[in-house]
């Protein structure tokens, strides 16, 4: 194949791959017709002048996972056809000025996972056709104004996993075609107003895992095409009322792991495409009426691991498409009987690890499609008559780790549970807490030796096996609830996730912390 170096493999498709620790310099001679060259996992420490001079047809060049620490400015001379250049996973600290001169066709430049300390405007001034620039995983502390001014065609810029402490509001101003901007895992404490104003075509903005405390009110007002906004794991303590008002295309918003104390009504406004909203691990203490009312298509709402002690009856107004609601690991003691009334499509509700002492009998009255209710680890002593009667699709009900009071009043619930044992799962059954003489005994098989008040035990059990639909159900107003359903965390397209199933109050829908990469 026009002379393939012994350390390399060459294919008929003009692809050359050179790998191995024994390689200490660019192998020669390389086939003149090579279009793709990969130099991987070698001990090459430097690139000298023009090592690729005779392979001018090269389109893709990958020099990755080597010991490369020094490159001569003319190393890539004569590669005018090169479209893809990766120098990722090396040991570069400095890029020589003019290194990319003459690479007029270059569209993708990957410099990630090196040790670059700085970049300068002159580095990329010749790369006018560049569409993708990957600089994540370096040691950049600042980006000088003008660094990207010539990259007017750039669509993807990754600056994540660096040491950026601030961003100039002018640094992105000429990137009108940019669709993806990633700044995750830096040390940004605030983003100046106007920083993203020129990014009119931006679709994804990743700001997670920084130290951002405040968001300017108009920070995203020019980003009408934004679809994915990642703000998780920052120090955001409040959201300006208008900060999300101009984001009609948004379909993914992550705010978990911040310091949000409150959410004002309409804060998430109009986002007709938003399907998931992740707000776990904040300090939210209450939910006012209509706080999510603009999110008409929302299907997943995660509010677990906050400090929510009060939910206004109209807090979930507008969420007619919601399927999953996670409220576990909060400080809920009571719930209004109408709080879930609007959630006609709800399938899973997670209320475990709260302080619920009672539940209103009508709490699930309009939520006929519920499939999973997690109420474990609350302070429930009993549940109202008929609370689950109409839930024909209910297949998972978790009631363990509550202080069930096994007196005569528990019989209707006990009888219903007897008939519906499969729904409770096999691992853990609810046990009695009081009276003390039956403590620890299974609620399902408990023998209640007390006379049963006739008012509570009609001839047909109040918790029938076959769901029934009373025309006008009357529910006594008592009891409480808490749940967890397994789901995965927000999957960012460059995120590594592990899912585990746990009952620990530190889990979020059985999810470990997302690690962005």
């Amino acid at each position: 194949y026009h002379g393939c170096p012994s350390e390399c493999t060459c294919s008929r498709a003009s692809q050359v791959e050179c790998t191995g620790a024994r390689i200490v310099a660019v192998p020669t001679p390389l086939p003149w017709n090579a279009m793709s060259l990969q130099i991987l996992n070698t001990h090459i420490t430097e690139l000298n002048e023009s090592p690729f001079l005779n392979i001018s047809a090269l389109i893709a060049l990958r020099i990755e996972k080597n010991e490369l620490s020094r490159i001569t400015p003319g190393a890539f001379r004569n590669l005018g056809s090169l479209r893809y250049l990766s120098l990722a996973n090396n040991k570069l600290q400095v890029l020589p000025i003019g290194l990319f001169q003459g690479l007029d066709s270059l569209e993708s430049l990957l410099l990630s996972s090196n040790q670059l300390l700085q970049i300068q405007p002159a580095h990329f001034s010749q790369c006018s056709n560049l569409k993708e620039l990957q600089l994540h995983g370096n040691h950049l502390e600042y980006i000088p104004d003008g660094a990207f001014d010539h990259l007017v065609g750039l669509t993807k810029l990754n600056l994540g996993k660096n040491s950026l402490t601030h961003i100039s509001p002018r640094v992105f101003q000429h990137l009108g075609n940019l669709q993806v901007l990633r700044l995750y895992e830096n040390r940004l404490t605030d983003i100046p107003m106007g920083t993203f104003d020129g990014l009119v075509n931006l679709q994804e903005l990743a700001l997670q895992q920084n130290q951002i405390g405040l968001l300017s009110p108009g920070l995203f007002h020019n980003n009408h095409n934004l679809q994915r906004l990642y703000l998780s794991n920052n120090h955001i303590s409040q959201l300006p009322p208008s900060v999300f008002m101009q984001l009609p295309q948004l379909n993914r918003l992550t705010l978990f792991g911040n310091s949000l104390k409150e959410l004002s009504p309409g804060i998430f406004g109009p986002m007709p495409n938003l399907r998931e909203l992740w707000l776990y691990d904040n300090h939210i203490s209450s939910l006012p009426d209509n706080v999510f009312s603009n999110l008409r298509q929302l299907q997943v709402l995660i509010l677990s691991r906050n400090q929510i002690s009060f939910i206004s009856p109209g807090a979930f107004n507008g969420l007619t498409e919601l399927r999953e609601l996670s409220l576990h690991t909060n400080a809920l003691q009571d719930l209004d009987g109408n709080v879930f009334r609007m959630l006609a499509n709800l399938q899973n509700i997670s209320l475990q690890n709260n302080r619920l002492r009672q539940l209103p009998g009508n709490i699930f009255a309009n939520v006929n499609g519920l499939m999973a209710i997690q109420l474990q680890n609350n302070q429930l002593e009993n549940l109202p008559l008929g609370i689950f009667d109409h839930l024909g699709k209910l297949c998972e009900l978790r009631l363990y780790d509550n202080p069930w009071r096994c007196d005569s009043d528990i019989l209707p619930l006990r009888n219903w549970l007897l008939l519906n044992q499969p729904r409770l799962g096999t691992d853990t059954v609810p046990v009695c807490f009081s009276p003390a003489n039956v403590r620890g005994q299974s609620l399902i098989i408990i023998n209640v030796n007390v006379a049963v008040p006739s008012v509570h035990v009609p001839e047909v059990p109040s918790y029938p096996e076959t769901p029934w639909y009373p025309d006008t159900p009357s529910y006594p107003d008592t009891t409480s609830v808490s749940s967890t359903t397994e789901l995965t965390s927000p999957v960012e397209d460059y995120t590594d996730l592990t899912t585990i199933q746990v009952t620990d109050d530190r889990s979020v829908w059985g999810m470990t912390q997302a690690q962005s990469g």
């Epitope: 690890n353 009672q358 680890n377 363990y400 780790d401 046990v431 807490f433």
Partner: antibody, heavy 120, light 112 residues
Amino acid sequence: EVQLVESGGGLVQPGGSLRLSCAVSGFSLTSYGVHWVRQATGKGLEWLGVIWAGGSTNYNSALMSRLTISKENAKSSVYLQMNSLRAGDTAMYYCATHMITEDYYGMDYWGQGTTVTVSS
Amino acid sequence: DIVMTQSPDSLAVSLGERATINCKSSQSLLNSRHRKNYLAWYQQKPGQSPKLLIYWASTRESGVPDRFSGSGSGTDFTLTISSLQAEDVAVYYCKQSYNLPTFGGGTKVEIK
């Protein structure tokens, strides 16, 4: 007879971790919850967390990131794992349960405690 | 978190006299629907583990002498030892379980 016996205390280096055990007898861990409480010398009581009969856990929010409570029902043992120890974690560590009391978070049976000293 | 503040820090009372310990919570411990205050009192004698005396603010644990009584509601609570005995020398702690438990700082009761 109901008994709770703590073990695993001793001298730990700052930054290290500890794993304390609470061996229970006279009752089943599938029926009763077990709490962990600590007390620095001459100081007050501090609730650390609880593992309930079904395995759910609750933790003191100030310590939650460093604590894990687990159990092995068959071995009648409850464990407290604590990481990133500092001098302020030096204390007597107790496990306790709610055997007779009507108070769900009441602790009416206690172990004798095990001493943990964090020092270099 | 709910903060529990006890007063006084220490108390010296003659044998047979009344001892009164106060406990104040940073928020109400009353669950109005259950009509219960989620407050308990513990006694810890020197070198011993704590002992539960009173729960739900005023319900004595079985076996606890009736000279011990609890009162109060909402945020203000009191433990009273109507006639102090020598064996009552101890540190007394209040504990809330309205939210996840927190203890007061303790009150040391001694004989005058």
